[in-house]
């Protein structure tokens, strides 16, 4: 079994490993998340994403997590087990993104644009919160992201 985000195939990443890493940090993250009214990965971001769209969307979402979320969060955590779990998530996200080759062909413009609009909904929600709250919430919602990604883990 492998991840198949439409035409983009990802090898060497097992959802179970991602989940184990998330579960190790989940209680810490979700306990610190005081804003229950807002959601970053809202339904409109991840619902009814076509296979073709999925490659663009997972690429932009994971890059955002790597460049913005993990990069800014590791120095706020002191517990060794939590730190290692962040690294496991980050390294697996790097492995996934490194293998993705979203098509830049002109005929894919509408699909690319649709995926980008979904990403902008997520980023807008992220920017509406203060930095600390946004980082905490984004990490707390990794389970939503993993649940969505797992739909693309196929034979």
């Amino acid at each position: 079994q492998e991840f198949h985000f439409g035409p983009c195939q990802v090898k060497g990443v097992v959802p179970q490993k991602l989940w184990e890493a998330f579960w190790a940090v989940k209680d810490t993250m979700q306990a610190q998340d005081n804003i229950t009214s807002a959601r970053l990965l809202q339904q409109e971001v991840l619902q009814n994403v076509s296979d073709a769209e999925s490659c663009y969307l997972v690429h932009t979402l994971l890059e955002f997590y790597l460049k913005t979320v993990f990069k800014n969060y590791h120095n706020r955590t002191v517990e060794v087990r939590t730190l290692k779990s962040f690294s496991t998530l980050a390294n697996n996200f790097v492995l996934i993104v490194s293998q993705l080759q979203p098509s830049q062909e002109n005929e894919m413009f509408s699909i690319r644009d649709s995926a980008h609009r979904r990403f902008l909904l997520f980023r807008r929600a992220f920017k509406q919160l203060d930095v600390e709250a946004a980082l905490t919430k984004a990490l707390g919602e990794v389970d939503i992201l993993l649940t969505w990604m797992q739909k693309f883990y196929k034979l």
């Epitope: 060497g12 993990f70 290692k84 690294s87 980050a90 790097v94 492995l95 490194s98 293998q99």
Partner: antibody, heavy 118, light 109 residues
Framework: QLQVVESGGGLVQPGGSLRLSCVAS????????MSWVRQAPGKGLEWIAG???????YYPDSLEGRFTISRDNAKNTLSLQMNSLKSEDTAVYYC????????????WGQGTQVTISS | SSALTQPSAVSVSLGQTARIACQGD??????ANWYQQKPGQAPALVIY???SRTSGIPERFSGSRSGGTATLSISGAQAEDEADYYC????????????FGGGTHLTVL
């Protein structure tokens, strides 16, 4: 038995080109990222190129586009094309399984010597 | 200059504990791996993901991490542990790229 074997090293004049090859066996080559790592005489290890199973390539900025990594999954072969060679490229060149970002170099070849001298 | 900093040399008395530190911004995000290299040989993976020991590696080898510093420890160092040790992580400015520390030569006295 997992194995990677490099070949193609030798003596080249500055400004010249060389193509290194690496043949892998004992694992499903087409499922893994591969890398080239070099070691200049008396110096440390330097990662110089990485490639995912599907051909996405990564290089350190320091190489200035002189080296190109490629692979042929059907032939279990990894290659490194080196152009505009300089004396500072003199080193033992290792082929290694893995190595995108912080992911491990799980298996190494014995290396092939490249000498750049006039 | 390397993005990962480790001492160029460490000495330890036979049977004592040797510690080699490796410091770098990216270690906080991505962790570290450690390789052992003996003269005339290819490097070999000793510790991966901060603290996981490669199969076949003696239990005296262990790894840990605190923030942006990873540490390789060898408790009860043996003569055969004399070698060069390299830490490895992702590049701090581009997580797709790999980077090694400058290497530490361990001498067992």
């Amino acid at each position: 038995q997992l194995q990677v074997v490099e070949s193609g090293g030798g003596l080249v004049q500055p400004g010249g080109s060389l193509r290194l090859s690496c043949v892998a066996s004992g694992f499903t080559f087409g499922d893994y990222a591969m890398s080239w790592v070099r070691q200049a005489p008396g110096k440390g290890l330097e990662w110089i190129a990485g490639i995912t199973w599907n051909g996405n390539t990564y290089y350190p900025d320091s190489l200035e586009g002189r080296f190109t990594i490629s692979r042929d999954n059907a032939k279990n072969t990894l290659s490194l094309q080196m152009n505009s060679l300089k004396s500072e490229d003199t080193a033992v060149y290792y082929c290694a399984k893995g190595g995108i970002g912080a992911t491990v170099f799980g298996s190494w070849g014995q290396g092939t010597q490249v000498t750049i001298s006039s | 200059s390397s993005a990962l900093t480790q001492p160029s040399a460490v000495s330890v008395s036979l049977g004592q504990t040797a510690r080699i530190a490796c410091q770098g911004d990216s270690i906080g995000n991505y962790g570290a791996n450690w390789y052992q290299q003996k003269p005339g040989q290819a490097p070999a993976l000793v510790i991966y993901d901060d603290d996981s020991r490669t199969s076949g590696i003696p239990e005296r080898f262990s790894g840990s991490r605190s923030g942006g510093t990873a540490t390789l420890s060898i408790s009860g160092a043996q003569a055969e542990d004399e070698a060069d040790y390299y830490c490895h992580s992702a590049d701090s400015s581009n997580y797709f790229l790999s980077v090694f520390g400058g290497g530490t030569h361990l001498t067992v006295l």
